[in-house]
C-alpha cells in the first residue's frame, strides 16, 4: 500500500507520458489522477512503467472502480491485464470481441494463464454461447482451447461454429469431448460432397458411431491409421473385416502394425480368422474357425 | 535464465567520461525496454536512462544532454555512455530489462561501481 503524500509542486501529471517513468511511487500515487489515468489508458502500453509503477496504477484504477472497471478502460489495460487477477476479472463485464482480442494478444504465445481462462469464461457467459467469431479467436490464440471444456460446456456450441475448427484444435480431446462435437460437426458439413465432406468430418470421427463408420466405408474414403485408431473402440467392433478394408482402403495394411493396439487389438479378437486372413497381413487372433460366436451384449438387450 | 552482466565502471575525474556495457543472456522472449537505474551512496535507486523496444529514449532531468543510451539488437548489448561526469553521478549502477509479453517481469543485473573523483 503506498503511502498517501502530498504532490510535490510542479508534478501534477496534465496526461500520461513518459516523464511519469520518472516518478517514484509515492509521487505516481500522489500526482497522477486517477481519472485522467483511466481516460488516457491506452497510452500506458508505450511507456516503459516498471514494475513497481504498475502496480501503483493498478491501485489507483482499484481505487476508481471497486466495483470492476468498465469496458473501455478494459480495452486499453494492455500489459497492465498482466497484473491483474482473477478475482478482478470476476467483476468485469467484457462483451466486445475487440476487447477479448486485445487482452489475449498481451498473452500470445503462453500457456492459458488463470487470468486468461476467467476473461474468457466471462466473455462467452456473457455472449450466452461460443459463437463463430469467438471460437476463432479463442482458437487462434489457444489452439487446445477447445479440448479444455468440459462436454456439458461443449454443448452450447452451435453447429455453425464448427467451421472455424481445425484439426489441431481437437488434438487434445478425450472422447466424451468429441461424442459432443461429431453431432454437431455432421450438421454443419451434412450440405458438402463425399470427399470434401470427409476431410472436414475426419478429425471428428472419434465420436462416430459404428453406422456411421458404416457408411463411410461405402464412400471410398481412405481413412489413414492416425484416424482409424482413433475411433471409438465400440465403435469399430461391430464392422466387418470388409467394411474396414473398405474404410482404410490402401491404408489397410497399416493394421498389421497396430494389431497389439486398441482398436484394431479388440477389433481382430471379434473377427473369424478366416476373413482376417483374407486381408493377407497376417493378422492373428481371431476366432478360429468353427466356433460359435455369442453376442452377448445382444444377449442382455433382449431380456 | 536470464542474466544480465554490466562491465565499464570505475575511477574518473570530473569532466571525465565512461561507457557502461549491460550484456543480455538467456532472453527467450521480446524485451520491451532495457534501462539504466543508480543508486548513490545513502539514497534511493533512481532511473537514469530507459530505451524502448522501439528504440525510443528517455532520460532523467539530471543526466539529459550528457548521456546517451544505446542498445545492440543482434548482441543483446545496451550501453550508457556518460559524460561531463560530475561527482553527483557517484554511485552503482544496474542495467535493467521489461518484460511485458505473457508475464510482467523486470530482470536487474549485478551493478557496476562508477566513482568521480579527483
Known amino acids: 500500500e503506498v503511502e498517501k503524500t502530498a504532490c510535490p509542486s510542479g508534478k501534477k501529471a496534465r496526461e500520461i507520458d513518459e516523464s511519469l517513468i520518472f516518478y517514484k511511487k509515492w509521487e505516481l500515487e500522489a500526482c497522477v489522477d486517477a481519472a485522467l489515468l483511466a481516460t488516457q489508458m491506452d497510452r500506458v502500453n508505450a511507456i516503459p512503467f516498471t514494475y513497481e509503477q504498475l502496480d501503483v496504477l493498478k491501485h489507483k484504477l482499484d481505487e476508481l472502480y471497486p466495483q470492476g472497471y468498465p469496458e473501455s478502460v478494459i480495452q486499453h489495460l494492455g500489459y497492465l491485464f498482466l497484473k491483474m487477477s482473477p478475482e478482478d476479472i470476476r467483476k468485469w463485464n467484457v462483451t466486445s470481441l475487440e476487447t477479448l482480442k486485445a487482452l489475449l494478444e498481451v498473452n500470445k504465445g503462453h500457456e492459458m494463464s488463470p487470468q486468461v481462462a476467467t476473461l474468457i469464461d466471462r466473455f462467452v457467459k456473457g455472449r450466452g454461447q461460443l459463437d463463430k467469431d469467438t471460437l476463432d479467436t479463442l482458437t487462434a490464440f489457444y489452439p487446445g482451447y477447445l479440448c479444455s471444456l468440459s462436454p456439458e460446456e461443449l454443448s452450447s456450441v452451435p453447429p455453425s461454429s464448427i467451421w472455424a475448427v481445425r484439426p489441431q484444435d481437437l488434438d487434445t480431446c478425450d472422447p466424451r469431448q468429441l461424442d459432443v462435437l461429431y453431432p454437431k460437426a455432421r450438421l454443419a458439413f451434412q450440405n458438402m460432397n463425399g470427399s470434401e465432406y470427409f476431410v472436414k468430418i475426419q478429425s471428428f470421427l472419434g465420436g462416430a458411431p459404428t453406422e456411421d463408420l458404416k457408411a463411410l466405408s461405402q464412400q471410398n474414403v481412405s481413412m489413414d491409421l492416425a484416424t482409424f485408431m482413433k475411433l471409438r473402440t465400440d465403435a469399430v467392433l461391430p464392422l466387418t473385416v470388409a467394411e474396414v478394408q473398405k474404410l482404410l482402403g490402401p491404408h489397410v495394411e497399416g493394421l498389421k502394425a497396430e494389431e497389439r493396439h486398441r482398436p484394431v487389438r479388440d477389433w481382430i479378437l471379434r473377427q473369424r480368422q478366416d476373413d482376417l486372413d483374407t486381408l493377407g497381413l497376417g493378422l492373428q487372433g481371431g476366432i478360429p474357425n468353427g466356433y460359435l460366436v455369442l453376442d452377448l451384449s445382444m444377449q442382455e438387450a433382449l431380456s | 535464465q536470464v542474466q544480465l552482466v554490466e562491465s565499464g565502471g570505475g575511477l574518473v575525474q570530473p569532466g571525465g567520461s565512461l561507457r557502461l556495457s549491460c550484456a543480455a543472456s538467456?532472453?527467450?522472449?521480446?524485451?520491451?525496454?532495457y534501462g539504466w537505474y543508480r543508486q548513490a551512496p545513502g539514497k534511493g535507486l533512481e532511473l537514469v536512462a530507459i530505451i524502448s523496444a522501439g528504440g525510443t529514449t528517455n532520460y532523467a532531468d539530471s543526466v539529459k544532454g550528457r548521456f546517451a543510451i544505446s542498445k545492440d539488437n543482434v548482441n543483446n548489448t545496451v550501453y550508457l555512455q556518460m559524460n561531463s561526469l560530475t561527482s553527483e553521478d557517484t554511485g552503482v549502477y544496474y542495467c535493467?530489462?521489461?518484460?511485458?509479453?505473457?508475464?510482467?517481469?523486470?530482470?536487474w543485473g549485478q551493478g557496476t561501481q562508477v566513482t568521480v573523483s579527483s
Open positions: 538467456g532472453i527467450t522472449f521480446p524485451v520491451n525496454a
Open positions: 535493467y530489462l521489461q518484460r511485458r509479453i505473457g508475464m510482467l517481469r523486470d530482470y
